[in-house]
């Protein structure tokens, strides 16, 4: 076990997105149990949930989590105020946009209030947990004879996202997918006018300002072209 | 690919003064917050000074002594520090961010905010 107790004004650091600690103790007890991790996503820096699976507990438990930030001038703890239950018991904490300080090190701390000793504090570095909303607004403007562009809009900063486009024909078996850095448009220079194509485009709060590994979810789809080939195996799976 | 130079740092006795530099190369002054931080051996990286947005923010301990501007036309970032002492002794580094000063929360000498950063400048004073 790592016995580190973290103070909010500690000096500990770490370069990982999270560092967990636990309280130490003297005797086998219900206090040896270890608490469930949480994880935190800050949702297009609107709100950020930080949520733990409650059914690892041995018996229902109202777990509690507090929050500060490390060597910052928010380094006061805080308790959560907007606790998410499941089952009725707590099993999150939403925090609202005023709470929320991307480039601050969050620390979180769960906690048994049964048993004050038995708890958990993990270090986490908010702006690798930003997830976008999905973009919005697709449009398909013809460039030429066969060339589409592709425009979307992202309810965001939209330097700081990358995304990622997807598009395929009623005939394809996978989709063909291209990087998009932060202009959020796409050229697709051969278009099969034969064919009917369809887009979707998702984005990433990366690099510029974070390193979110989390993706945002797809956007709808978009279509274009013809759609008379009634015998295509693909086109329903593909409107499923 | 962003690169900050940094210029101008030296040996200085206390009460003199420094102008430090720094040109900004794949990066466009905006809105964005550039800023200067400071390490003394054995400390830990503090903020300094930072500009955007028309805004400019400085550390406690060198308001009305250093002046933060940027030279949109040359690229340029600048620190004037005037009335330096012993304890403003260290490596001088420029950085820069894709995000304004205080935008996301949390202050604007929050290292994390910036992405880019220069190699430094060593200032010394002496007494």
């Known amino acids: 076990l790592n016995t580190t107790i973290l103070t909010p004004n500690g000096n500990e650091d770490t370069t990982a997105d999270f560092f967990l600690t636990t309280m130490p103790t003297d005797s086998l007890s219900v206090s040896t149990l270890p608490l469930p991790e949480v994880q935190c996503f800050v949702f297009n820096v609107e709100y950020m949930n930080c949520t733990w699976n409650s059914s690892s507990e041995p018996q229902p438990t109202n777990l509690t989590l507090h929050y500060w930030y490390k060597n910052s001038d928010n380094d006061k703890v805080q308790k959560c105020s907007h606790y998410l239950f499941s089952e009725e018991i707590t099993s999150g904490c939403q925090l609202q946009k005023k709470e929320i300080h991307l480039y601050q090190t969050f620390v979180v701390q769960l906690q048994d209030p049964r048993e004050p000793r038995r708890q958990a504090t993990q270090m986490l570095k908010l702006q690798n947990l930003v997830i976008p909303w999905a973009p919005e607004n697709l449009t398909l403007h013809k460039l030429s004879e066969s060339q589409l562009e592709l425009n979307w809009n992202n309810r965001f900063l939209n330097h700081c996202l990358e995304h990622l486009v997807q598009y395929r024909t009623d005939w394809d078996h996978s989709w063909t997918e291209q990087s998009v850095d932060y202009r959020h448009k796409f050229s697709l220079p051969s278009v099969d006018g034969q064919k009917r194509y369809t887009f979707r485009v998702r984005s990433r709060f990366n690099p510029l300002c974070g390193s979110a590994q989390h993706w945002s979810e797809w956007s709808h789809p978009i279509h274009w072209g013809s759609n008379t080939s009634k015998e295509n195996p693909f086109l329903f799976a593909l409107e499923a | 690919q962003v690169q900050l130079q940094e210029s101008g740092g030296g040996s200085v006795q206390a009460g003199g003064s420094l102008r430090l530099s720094c040109v900004a190369s794949?990066?466009?002054?905006?809105?964005?917050?550039m800023g200067w931080f400071r390490q003394a051996p054995g400390k830990e990286r503090e903020g300094v000074a930072a500009?955007?947005?028309?805004?400019?923010y400085y550390a406690d301990s060198v308001k009305g002594r250093f002046t933060i501007s940027q030279d949109n036309a040359k690229n340029t970032l600048y620190l004037q520090m005037n009335s330096l002492k012993p304890e403003d002794t260290a490596m001088y580094y420029c950085?820069?961010?894709?995000?304004?000063?205080?935008?996301?929360?949390?202050?604007?000498?929050?290292?994390?905010?910036?992405?880019?950063w220069g190699q430094g400048t060593q200032v010394t004073v002496s007494s």
């Open positions: 950085a820069a961010a894709w995000v304004a000063c205080l935008e996301f929360g949390g202050s604007w000498y929050d290292l994390a905010r910036y992405k880019h």
């Open positions: 794949g990066y466009t002054f905006s809105s964005y917050c």
């Open positions: 500009l955007g947005g028309g805004s400019t």
